[in-house]
């Protein structure tokens, strides 16, 4: 039994780091290899991860963490009984991927701007809390062409667009997600998709010829 | 419930010696690392032996590496500091403290044994 | 060694009062510091560990904050209860353990 690709890791600096690695043939990751980690430190216990099985030849392992400090450094080791395997080093700080935002809801009740507002991801002690951009992907379920990014570059996990920016009458989707530059992290996830139908109502003049066109067609 | 229970304080004379004890329950005491803290009429606390889970490494400041050894019996779910040499300014209330599980801060203490060093 | 400074040393408070008790420390210690609350002939007790996180069982009104070398306890509304010594201690670069001279809050 032998690794075919090391195990990388990613943190959500917070409590969960994810390591995923592949083996060299068909294995069941969680009966026969475990996961050692520790901090590096003289006391700190270690702690065992039970993978589980991601593909036939990949495994995944959630390690739990205590919260993360910037200068945190774990030794890991991959055992499979009493072989070892790997063994190699994972510091939380250089592999973030954020956790993604969530509850994600739009607001259309003023009629000519969508409100859409989501949950930072992380307490307002965590670090990540006041470091988060976000992107926001809309798109139409009727027509694949039509699909937007908006970029959020401030704090406030909310964005307003112009009604008038989609077009009416169709249903649209959303969704987010997260990254911070201060540690150059990687995104998150994209956050569920939240669905609404835009109802926009033109101004008469524009809604009359827009009908008109439509006619044609 | 984590308890930690000091016991070997007392009265000594200079330059003799003294060996503490610390009685854990309520918890794995093999897996944790353990320490010694003392504290100083002048209530200052000082760290003063750390020992890891399986007793292969030690560590001691300067003010007492030579005199003292940390030890540990994790079939009797014993601490021990064993003093020698002992100094007035070794006059304190000697707590033993359990290293948090994911930090080296203490997260339970002893409510500590008094040694007294005088002629 | 990291040497740690605590202030003030002692300070006067009536109950419901915003304490705050800082501690410095000589070198970078990111945020590997504990903090404690010890009362007359008791053990120290654990109430925050990595500069923010309390520990278990500690109430809200208690809260630490900073990284670095300049770290704060503390207390929204002091209770009668919280009158006591409190101490900093670092953790980082272990095999090495440092406390702060301790903040005694006396009651006014």
């Known amino acids: 039994m032998k690794v075919l690709q090391e195990p990388t890791c990613v943190s959500d600096y917070m409590s969960i780091s994810t390591c995923e690695w592949k083996m060299n043939g068909p294995t069941n990751c969680s009966t026969e290899l475990r996961l050692l980690y520790q901090l590096v430190f003289l006391l700190s216990e270690a702690h065992t991860c039970i993978p589980e099985n991601n593909g036939g030849a990949g495994c995944v392992c959630h390690l739990l963490m205590d919260d993360v400090v910037s200068a945190d450094n774990y030794t890991l080791d991959l055992w499979a009984g009493q072989q070892l395997l790997w063994k190699g080093s994972f510091k939380p700080s250089e592999h973030v991927k954020p956790r993604a935002p969530g509850n994600l809801t739009v607001h259309t009740n003023v009629s000519d701007t969508l409100l859409l507002t989501w949950s930072n991801p992380y307490p307002p002690d965590n670090y990540l809390y006041n470091h988060l951009t976000y992107a926001v992907n809309i798109w139409s379920e009727n027509d694949p062409a039509d699909f937007r990014i908006y970029n959020v570059t401030y704090l406030e996990p909310s964005l307003r667009i112009a009604a008038s920016t989609l077009k009416s009458g169709i249903s649209y989707r959303a969704r987010v997600r997260a990254w911070a530059q201060c540690y150059n992290t990687t995104w998150s996830e994209w956050s569920p998709s939240t669905k609404w139908h835009n109802s926009y109502r033109e101004p008469f003049e524009q809604h009359h010829h827009h009908h008109h066109h439509h006619h044609h067609h | 419930e984590v308890q930690l229970v000091e016991s070997g304080g007392g009265l000594v004379q200079p330059g003799g010696s003294l060996r503490l004890s610390c009685a854990a329950s309520?918890?794995?005491?093999?897996?944790?690392?353990m320490s010694w803290v003392r504290q100083s009429p002048d209530k200052r606390l000082e760290w003063v032996s750390t020992i890891n889970s399986n007793g292969g490494s030690t560590s001691y400041p300067d003010s007492v590496k030579g005199r003292f050894t940390i030890s540990r019996d994790n079939a009797k779910n014993t601490l021990y500091l064993q003093m020698r040499s002992l100094r007035a300014e070794d006059t304190a209330v000697y707590y033993c403290?359990?290293?948090?599980?994911?930090?080296?801060?203490?997260?339970?203490w002893g409510q500590g044994t008094l040694v007294t060093v005088s002629s | 060694d990291i040497q740690m400074t605590q202030s003030p040393s002692s300070l006067s408070a009536s109950v419901g009062d915003r304490v705050t008790i800082t501690c410095r420390t000589s070198e970078n210690i990111y945020s590997y510091l504990a903090w404690y609350q010890q009362k007359p002939g008791k053990a120290p007790k654990f109430l925050v560990y990595n500069a923010k996180t309390l520990a278990e069982g500690v109430p809200s009104r208690f809260s630490g904050s900073g990284s670095g070398t300049d770290f704060t306890l503390t207390i929204s509304s002091l209770q009668p209860e919280d009158f006591a010594t409190y101490y900093c201690q670092h953790y980082y670069g272990p095999p090495t353990w440092t406390f702060g001279q301790g903040t005694k809050v006396e009651i006014k």
């Open positions: 403290a359990r290293f948090f599980r994911f930090r080296n801060a203490m997260d339970y």
């Open positions: 309520g918890f794995t005491f093999s897996t944790y690392g």
